[in-house]
Interface confidence: low
């Protein structure tokens, strides 16, 4: 079981609060499935509280992952029968320690509530409860103490007191021969493994089963309504009689079933099928799974096993459910195959632990000056002038899609391509026609531009050719990522489908034109565009491309 | 020893379905993966998807998505792949292989050979 | 998805030759390639696993490398009963990809 915090719910801080070291206590309360669920009612079927605790201390600054909790189970001893049907209540408790905690000494973190159904003898159940920032993972099982016996508890075995027979006044105990069981009181005829009595002459049935003896399964379409039945009224059908019935693992072992077959798990001092070895030593390989076993060279002292990554318990029994801790990023879903554990990636994802992004910039190269755009889920390079192809390593002639208009000469340049106008044009690419008085130089309207004062658009006539970035109103975006960790640069690269922020600061060039920006009626101030996304924090700079001058010829 | 049993060959009709069942014995079934692979007559193997036996997830290649299903009974160590609206080109052997812990495919069944002829 | 082609599609070597046969992934897929032996009618083998491990039972003649992009399955001595067609697939990522094949034949 682990305690730690949930999944996309930000990142609490390690549970000592910042106040010095600190114990968690998991209270467990057992209640009557048929009892409304209230905060005030009685753990009538039992409570208990964990033991032996490891003490926490604070390391300001860290984040709680999941925690180590206490070795060992968290035993409640119940009352009575085993009702099959019950709520179980877990609450989380830190304990402050140390002088200078402040405050209360005792808090209640978490608290989560479920009812459940379990048989007794039942293998081990799993279960995840989130409540705020905080995940309890745990396992539960409901097993019979010696003597009772069944999926009810009700059953009495004793233990055999003769090597051949029972002893006075009892008989074989029908799943275990070797033990013996008190004679029956129940109606004569009340099934064994499905009924029990707790007056003479009387057949209560487990959950599942109904019928005066107790041998009529009751059909399942009964659970399809909330009513949760006391153990003698019909109910949902719970897994019949299994091969963990009546708990074959003696000294305190707890069963679990595995192909129709059980497994053991013993307690620290025991081995064996039913843990019936006692006075182990490491010489008995007591450790399994690859454990280390250390110590306990002679019967009279303890061994300790020494676990291999995967595996927890006294003997290394139980495998740690590693997919717990999620390690799967983006979304992948994790499966631990026992040796290894792998990740399935969600599409657009990649690697061991599916942290590599295919659809971003980040393993991405464009050559050439070329820079990775994103957009739409895929990525491309918007290569520099000259330039071509899916990387940018192909040769292009910027010249080749001519750029010039109105009968201009396009010529490369080292910085892309220069323009050089007919008479009567000018402009970047010649798309402004000058008029035959040199008065005003009157745009050809190009988009992104709004018409207005004319006399904004005055160039000096002497400038036979400018080239200046951004006179469509496209000044460049340069976009700097910077992810969350120090100094972690991811370069420099440019997204697309962005909606073009206002631009309060134009280059030079620019001054006297206005952007086009939705209905407004100029540059907005809003230099502080920076919207973050996916935890990246980005500035935004606007980067005036170099104005060429040129005469006329 | 670890081992891939898979139902017997199956002659369809295009349009109908098919269903395959792999029955694992010799390990803990819900400890480890199962894929299914299929290879038509003189082609590549190509992978359909698989399934993860533990919590009864399946992940489908986009190929197949829509017409494969893979489901698993954990009481019968059995995982299966149901394939619908069969055409000509489905005609090939199916395989499951167990994900090993440190590969894809560490063993494979027999194979099952899937006809879809009018 | 990331395609992984193989090459020769077919080879013909006299035994005790040393054999190559090359994978190339569309895209770097670290080291998660596994390489396959499928004799005739038989079903597919592991030989190799995270590029350059050699599954249990896989004789030592059998060796793999590479890593990113570039994989190689190298027989260092081919002796007759490797004949058989060899295959590699990226477990990178979803889906999992298969080569087309490479066809061993004995001189």
């Known amino acids: 079981h682990s305690f730690g915090p949930g999944p996309g719910l930000g990142t609490p801080r390690s549970p000592c609060n910042a106040r010095g070291p600190c114990r968690l206590f998991f209270r467990v309360c057992l209640k009557p499935g048929v009892s409304q669920e209230a905060t005030e009612s009685l753990c009538a079927l039992g409570a208990a509280l964990s033991t032996s605790v490891p003490v926490y201390t604070e390391h300001p600054g860290e984040s709680a992952a999941a925690l180590p909790l206490p070795d060992g189970l968290v035993r409640v001893p119940f009352r009575d029968a085993w009702p099959g049907t019950f709520s179980l209540v877990i609450e989380t408790w830190r304990e402050q320690l140390g002088e200078h905690a402040g405050g209360p000494a005792w808090n209640l973190l978490a608290r989560v509530v479920g009812r459940r159904r379990l048989a007794a003898g039942g293998p081990w159940a799993r279960d995840v409860q989130r409540t705020g920032t905080w995940e309890l993972h745990f396992s539960y099982r409901a097993r019979c103490e010696p003597p009772a016996v069944g999926a009810a508890c009700a059953r009495l075995c004793r233990s055999r007191s003769a090597p051949s027979r029972c002893g006075p006044g009892l008989r074989p105990c029908t799943p275990f021969p070797d033990e013996c069981e008190a004679p029956s009181v129940c109606r004569p005829g009340c099934s064994p493994e499905h009924g029990y009595c707790e007056e003479p002459d009387e057949c209560r049935c487990l959950e599942g089963w109904t019928g005066p003896l107790c041998t009529v399964p009751v059909s399942t379409s009964s659970c399809l309504n909330s009513r949760v039945p006391g153990p003698a009224s019909t109910g949902c059908l719970l897994p019949g009689p299994g091969p963990c019935d009546g708990n074959p693992c003696a000294n305190g072992g707890s069963c679990s079933e595995t192909s129709g077959s059980f497994e053991c798990a013993c307690p620290r001092g025991f081995y064996g099928l039913r843990c019936e070895v006692s006075g182990v030593t490491c010489a008995d390989g007591p450790c399994f799974n690859g454990g280390l076993c250390v110590g306990g060279e002679d019967p009279d002292s303890a061994y300790v096993c020494h676990c291999p990554p995967g595996f927890q318990g006294s003997n290394c029994e139980k495998r740690v459910d590693r997919c717990s801790l999620q390690p799967c990023q983006n979304g992948g879903l994790c499966l631990d195959l026992g040796h290894a554990l792998r990740c399935r990636c969600r599409a657009g994802f990649a690697g061991p632990r599916c942290e590599h992004d295919l659809d971003d910039c980040a393993g991405r190269a464009c050559a050439n000056g070329g820079t990775c755009v994103e957009g739409g889920g895929s990525r491309r390079c918007s290569c520099a002038l000259g330039f071509g192809g899916r990387d940018c390593r192909e040769r292009a002639d910027p010249c080749a899609s001519r750029p010039c208009a109105h009968g201009g000469r396009c010529y490369a340049h080292f910085s892309g391509l220069v323009c050089a106008c007919a008479p009567g044009y000018m402009g970047v690419r010649c798309e402004f026609a000058v008029r035959p008085d040199g008065a005003d130089a009157v745009p050809a309207a190009p988009r992104g531009l709004r018409q207005a004062d004319p006399q904004r658009f005055l160039l000096p006539p002497a400038l036979g050719l400018l080239v200046a970035a951004g006179l469509a109103g496209a000044a460049l975006l340069v976009i700097h990522v910077r992810r969350r960790g120090p100094g972690q640069d991811t370069g420099t690269r440019l997204l697309s489908g962005t909606r073009e922020p206002s631009v309060h600061t134009l280059p030079d060039a620019l001054n006297n034109l206005r952007l086009q920006d939705g209905a407004g009626d100029g540059p907005s101030s809003s230099a502080d565009w920076n919207h973050p996304e996916d935890g990246d924090s980005r500035s935004i700079y606007v980067i005036p491309a170099p104005s060429i001058y040129a005469r006329e010829a | 020893q670890v081992q891939l049993v898979q139902s017997g060959a199956e002659v369809k009709k295009p349009g109908a379905s098919v269903k395959v069942s792999c029955k694992a014995s010799g390990y803990t079934f819900t400890n480890y993966g199962m894929n299914w692979v299929r290879q038509a007559p003189g082609q590549r193997l190509e992978w359909m998807g698989w399934i993860n036996t533990y919590t009864g997830d399946p992940t489908y290649a986009d190929d197949f998505k829509g017409r494969v299903t893979i489901t698993r009974d954990t009481s019968a160590s059995t995982a299966y792949m149901e394939l619908s609206s069969l055409r000509s080109e489905d005609t090939a052997v199916y395989y499951c292989a167990r994900i090993g812990g440190n590969s894809p495919s560490d063993y494979w069944g027999q194979g099952t050979t899937v006809t879809v002829s009018s | 998805d990331i395609q992984m082609t193989q090459s020769p599609s077919s080879l013909s070597a006299s035994v005790g030759d040393r054999v190559t046969i090359t994978c190339k992934a569309s895209?770097?897929?670290?080291?998660?390639v596994a390489w396959y032996q499928q004799k005739p009618g038989k079903v597919p083998k592991l030989l190799i696993y995270y590029a350059s491990n050699r599954y249990s039972g896989v004789p030592s003649r059998f060796s793999g490398s590479g890593s990113g992009t570039d994989f190689t399955l190298t027989i260092s001595s081919l002796q007759p009963e490797d004949v058989a067609t060899y295959f590699c697939?990226?477990?990178?990522?979803?889906?999992?990809?298969f080569g087309g094949g490479t066809k061993v034949e004995i001189k």
């Open positions: 697939q990226q477990d990178y990522s979803s889906p999992w990809t």
């Open positions: 895209q770097s897929v670290s080291n998660d």
